[in-house]
């Protein structure tokens, strides 16, 4: 069974998937739609890297540009260095300055909904 | 204003290779993902892949993986289409497209493939 | 893959008509989180290249005149040219951008008396 087959099978329960389970389908050659991808809980999305979103979506990576301002795309593009973001090919803004450092400091997120950031 | 820039024609013998170029210009050409798309006479449209300008990664339709191979030159601002052991069935317009929607269109190339 | 079918295949009407073409898919192109339609219409004029009328089922290109209407959601999706005019002669693709690969209709040609 290819990624893609396999998708299929359990796309209807992924809605509450973890994290670490998405983790590993971006490992599977899946090619989620980005109709699904927001579906997911935004807490399972939010630790995801570029490279792993990228992976677990494959083409349909491209339409995050178009859901930029929809959560939990709008989240998860807060979350991630901009050096990063730019290796997607969209344009994509709002991602943490570089040289800039992330506290994760669970109370500050929690309070403000976005990461504490150190400036150079 | 924004172009994606083609050449007219190309004319091709069966079994040989053909590279189609698409210039870009006046927009950030790492900024859209760039797709091709054939057409032919009474045959409409047909998706054949994408790649991202940015980090070269690309993604194709399952019929046209053998077929073509997909390239870009980030210095220059321009995609490239490789199609390979061609056949008449390869005759068509080709087109470059830019972005999620094709929002803009190349000025597309004839390839004929003739001996 | 998804299945994109258009009706009728040629339309021939006269200047001023209302015209009102037809796109359907085989499966849904809505994402419910952001309530978009990922369907597009292009045109496209004899010996030229496609050019975007709508996207998102319903959202002008800019610059695209405002007789160009499209509306739809899930599965049946609708362009209507409220009044043609000349310069309309082409033919008109509808695109699904939901899942690669991307999947294009057959088109419908339409003619002017």
């Known amino acids: 069974m290819n990624g893609s087959e396999y998708f299929v099978k359990i796309q209807s329960f992924l809605g509450g998937a973890p994290t670490e389970d998405l983790k590993a389908l971006s490992q599977q050659n899946v090619s989620m739609d980005l109709a699904t991808f927001m579906k997911l809980r935004t807490d399972a999305v939010l630790p995801l890297t570029v490279a792993e979103v990228q992976k677990l979506l494959g083409p349909h990576v491209e339409g995050l540009k178009a859901e930029e301002r929809h959560r939990p795309v709008r989240d998860w593009i807060l979350r991630q260095r901009q050096d990063d973001l730019d290796t997607l090919g969209l344009g994509l803004q709002g991602g943490i300055p570089n040289g800039y450092l992330v506290l994760d400091l669970s109370m500050q997120e929690a309070l403000s909904g976005t990461p504490c950031l150190l400036g150079p | 204003q924004v172009q994606l820039q083609q050449p007219g024609t190309e004319l091709v013998k069966p079994g040989a290779s053909v590279k189609l170029s698409c210039k870009a210009s006046?927009?950030?050409?790492?900024?859209?993902?760039m797709h091709w798309v054939k057409q032919r006479p009474g045959q409409g449209l047909e998706w054949i892949g994408s790649?991202?300008?940015?980090?070269?990664?690309?993604y194709y339709n399952e019929k046209f993986k053998n077929k073509a191979t997909l390239t870009v030159d980030k210095s220059s601002s321009t995609a490239y289409m490789q199609l390979s052991s061609l056949t008449s069935d390869d005759s068509a317009v080709y087109y470059c497209?830019?972005?999620?929607?094709?929002?803009?269109w190349g000025t597309g190339t004839t390839v004929t493939v003739s001996s | 893959d998804i299945v994109m079918t258009q009706s009728p295949s040629s339309l021939t009407v006269s200047v001023g008509q209302k015209v009102t073409m037809s796109c359907k898919s085989s499966?849904?192109?809505?994402?419910?989180?952001?309530?978009?339609?990922?369907l597009a219409w292009y045109q496209q004029k004899p010996g030229q290249s496609p050019k975007l009328l709508v996207y998102?089922?319903?959202t002008r290109e800019s610059g695209v005149p405002d007789r160009f209407i499209g509306s739809g959601s899930g599965t049946d999706f609708t362009l209507i040219i409220s009044s043609v005019q000349a310069e309309d002669l082409a033919d008109y693709f509808c695109?699904?951008?939901?899942?690669?690969?991307?999947?294009f209709g057959g088109g419908t040609k339409l003619e002017i008396i």
């Open positions: 497209a830019r972005g999620w929607y094709f929002d803009v």
């Open positions: 006046d927009y950030t050409f790492t900024s859209y993902w």
């Open positions: 790649i991202n300008p940015s980090n070269g990664d690309t």
């Open positions: 499966q849904s192109l809505l994402n419910s989180s952001s309530q978009k339609n990922y």
């Open positions: 998102f089922a319903s």
């Open positions: 695109q699904q951008h939901y899942s690669t690969p991307r999947t």
